[in-house]
């Protein structure tokens, strides 16, 4: 499979939102590449969200996903909001060269993403 | 129209050595990671070894079982992919094919090796 | 080396029926899987690749699906010239891209 890389680790913002790059090697001139970003929890995996774009065009995820991404040559600079603490664990960037063929899968040894819920305001007299 | 031709498959007494070829046209092959995927007599398939291709430094793998026997090779400017295989053993007996990625397969060339 | 374990080895339906065969991996393989048809006398043709996308020229009667460990190639509606055998196939590095032991699909 391809070889692809993602950092290792990655905090999120106090708001819940971690950024972090998914790049890959390509063996081919590919056209059309899926980019899908997995979470990993003991032996279960379940899709996070997924976008295919056409080299050269933006990333673009469906609207009611809390992905969003851009992409420049064989970088892919992909965003998750919405995280809250129960969301830490590790998220794979798995990218596929979809057309034209051959067909390349690529996996990534995944993000450990850290979330921390930001402490309530203490209610204030003033 | 995408063709992969293996050929130099026959008949090979145990411990010698046979060179099979497998000759690409339609496609790029210089994008392709080539494998070797064999098939004995009423049995499933066998991979058998991949080289990948220049931005992957002509990598190269190969299954448990013909591992220090068999190397794979590639010249670019012909569109050819070789498997040099060495030390054959009777187990070795299959039909060997060539593939483009996983998508381009073709027709398979026999070896048998017997005594 | 990751394990593939296909099953039936072998079935027998009609024409029309509902065809289903499981491949499943001895570790997580992210649907980084193969289905091939290998018709009688032919060589193997990719029928499935990732997991879930169609082949060019395969017909859509035939799909892929699963993620993890666990995948599953469907007929939906088995015909005539789908008489051959299938294989699976892990395709994440490291190699082996070891396949799956093969189902040989006949007619009732």
């Known amino acids: 499979a391809m070889h692809v890389a993602q950092p290792a680790v990655v905090l999120a913002s106090s708001r819940g939102i971690a950024s972090f790059v998914c790049e890959y090697a390509s063996p081919g001139k590919a056209t059309e590449v899926r980019v899908t970003v997995l979470r990993q929890a003991d032996s279960q995996v379940t899709e996070v969200c997924a976008a295919t774009y056409m080299m050269g065009n933006e990333l673009t995820f469906l609207d009611d996903s809390i992905c969003t991404g851009t992409s420049s040559g064989n970088q892919v600079n992909l965003t998750i909001q919405g995280l809250r603490a129960m969301d830490t664990g590790l998220y794979i960037c798995k990218v596929e060269l979809m057309y034209p063929p051959p067909y390349y899968l690529g996996i990534g040894n995944g993000t450990q993403i850290y979330v921390i819920d930001p402490e309530p305001c203490p209610d204030s007299d003033f | 129209e995408v063709q992969l031709v293996e050929s130099g498959g026959g008949l090979v007494q145990p411990g010698r050595s046979l060179r099979l070829s497998c000759t690409a046209s339609g496609f790029t092959f210089s994008d392709n990671w080539m494998n070797w995927v064999r098939q004995a007599p009423g049995k499933g398939l066998e991979w058998v070894g991949q080289i990948r291709n220049k931005p992957y430094n002509y990598e190269t793998y190969y299954s448990d079982s013909v591992k220090g026997r068999f190397t794979i090779s590639r010249d670019d400017s012909k569109s050819i992919a070789y498997l040099q295989m060495n030390s054959l053993k009777t187990e070795d007996t299959a039909v060997y094919y060539c593939?483009?990625?996983?998508?381009?397969w073709g027709q398979g060339t026999t070896v048998t090796v017997s005594s | 080396d990751i394990q593939m374990t296909q099953s039936p080895s072998s079935l027998s339906a009609s024409v029309g029926d509902r065809v289903t065969i499981t491949c499943g991996a001895s570790e997580i393989i992210y649907g980084a899987l193969n289905w091939y048809q290998q018709k009688p006398g032919k060589s193997p043709k990719l029928l499935i690749y990732g997991a879930t996308n169609l082949a060019d020229g395969m017909p859509s009667r035939f799909s892929g699906s699963g993620s993890g460990r666990d995948y599953t190639l469907t007929i939906s509606s088995l015909q005539p010239e789908d008489v051959a055998t299938y294989y699976c196939q892990k395709i994440l590095s490291p190699p082996p891209w070891t396949f799956g032991g093969g189902t040989k699909v006949e007619i009732k």
């Open positions: 593939t483009g990625g996983m998508d381009y």
